[in-house]
């Protein structure tokens, strides 16, 4: 398997780079911007015309251990009267993030980076209508 | 760090939590999933709160390209295709983890970084502040 771009760079490797065994990389998991907070508008998940709920998934062998996933509440969108309009669609908006997975093999522990797709919220869209001939 | 249950038979390590620095396999699991939001769906055009995409590129980061959503309107698109300013387009934001080269320019040494990205926009009823 090819080594992914994460280990490639077009820069000259500086002398100060730490020695790393082949096929692996050194990862410091002390997070930069750890205390940054999301400043989203207040409770948009309830005020949206495509409202959603949140569920928290927890895995002690993943870092971070908690990942929050959104689920659209309706198939349609909420109209001005507060009723569901099924001529429109609530659809999930997704974003990739990285997590570190910890694997136990007997007493040895290995770490693997993993891409996880997170559903962040929902938006209301006009449906694509397929006409059958 | 976060506390991880350990096999009691394993030798003691320097830290009972997730260690501060780990050696990680270079092959990223699921790394070939689609990262370009334009190719994955056209929701950004079909939404009642449509958005544009801003390409944020940083070679010192993995992934080096992140797409940021910017809402096209302050209002939302109504059934007639016009902007309705009684509703608001707002960004949906998410904290994601990325890798930052540390020390800078090093090919195989990284630190996790938390960044805030706007992923898309959604149409909401505005919060109306009534003046007493």
């Amino acid at each position: 398997r090819k080594i992914p771009k994460v280990g490639h760079t077009f820069f000259q490797k500086p002398e100060s780079c730490p020695p790393v065994p082949g096929g692996s990389m050194k990862l410091d998991i002390g997070i930069i911007n750890e205390n940054q907070r999301v400043s989203m508008s207040r409770n948009i998940e309830s005020r949206s015309t495509s409202p959603w709920n949140y569920t928290v998934t927890w895995d002690p062998n993943r870092y971070p251990s908690e990942v929050v996933q959104a689920q659209c509440r309706n198939l349609g969108c909420i109209n001005a009267q507060g009723k569901e309009d099924i001529s429109m669609n609530s659809v999930p908006i997704q974003q990739e993030t990285l997590v570190v997975r910890r694997k136990h093999q007997g007493c040895s522990v290995s770490f693997q980076l993993e891409k996880v797709l997170v559903t962040v919220g929902c938006t209301c869209v006009t449906p694509v209508i397929h006409h059958v001939q | 760090g976060i506390t991880i249950p350990r096999n009691p038979g394993c030798p003691n390590s320097e830290d009972k939590n997730f260690p501060r620095t780990v050696m990680v396999n270079l092959n990223i699991h699921n790394r070939n999933t689609n990262t370009n939001p334009k190719r994955s769906s056209d929701y950004y055009n079909r939404s009642t709160s449509p958005w544009n995409l801003h390409r944020n590129e940083d070679p010192e980061r993995y992934p080096s390209v992140i797409w940021e959503a910017k809402c096209r309107h302050l209002g939302c698109i109504n059934a007639d295709g016009n902007v309705d300013y009684h509703m608001n387009s707002v960004p949906i934001q998410q904290e994601i983890l990325v890798l930052r080269r540390e020390p800078p320019h090093c090919p195989n040494s990284f630190r996790l970084e938390k960044i805030l990205v706007s992923v898309g926009c959604t149409c909401v009823t505005p919060i109306v502040h009534h003046v007493a």
Epitope: - | K38, N52, W67, K70, G75
Partner: nanobody, 117 residues
Amino acid sequence: EVQLVESGGGLVQPGGSLRLSCAASGFTLGYYAIGWFRQAPGKEREGVSCDSSSDGDTYYANSVKGRFTISTDNGKNTVYLQMNSLKPEDTAVYYCATCTDWNYDYWGQGTQVTVSS
């Protein structure tokens, strides 16, 4: 209340530079596709630049490409238009607004740019 206030215009000689500012209040500029527009006397209002687009690139009108640069300072809730190598045909009133909103309730008063020797 949503408000956009443009500043930084003035009289400049051909080949000179100006930096226009647009300060926003009532909403967070960085979350929206923000653009600069201009209107010359007797002409239609035209789009000059937009900080994002449907294809991910910053948009510039052909007449200003390579000379004008749009940027945003999220901390100051301000968008800028750096205008270099100005030409007499750049003379106009410059406005900022969300790139696709032609609702004039949300447009500022504009700032006059005059390029003349």
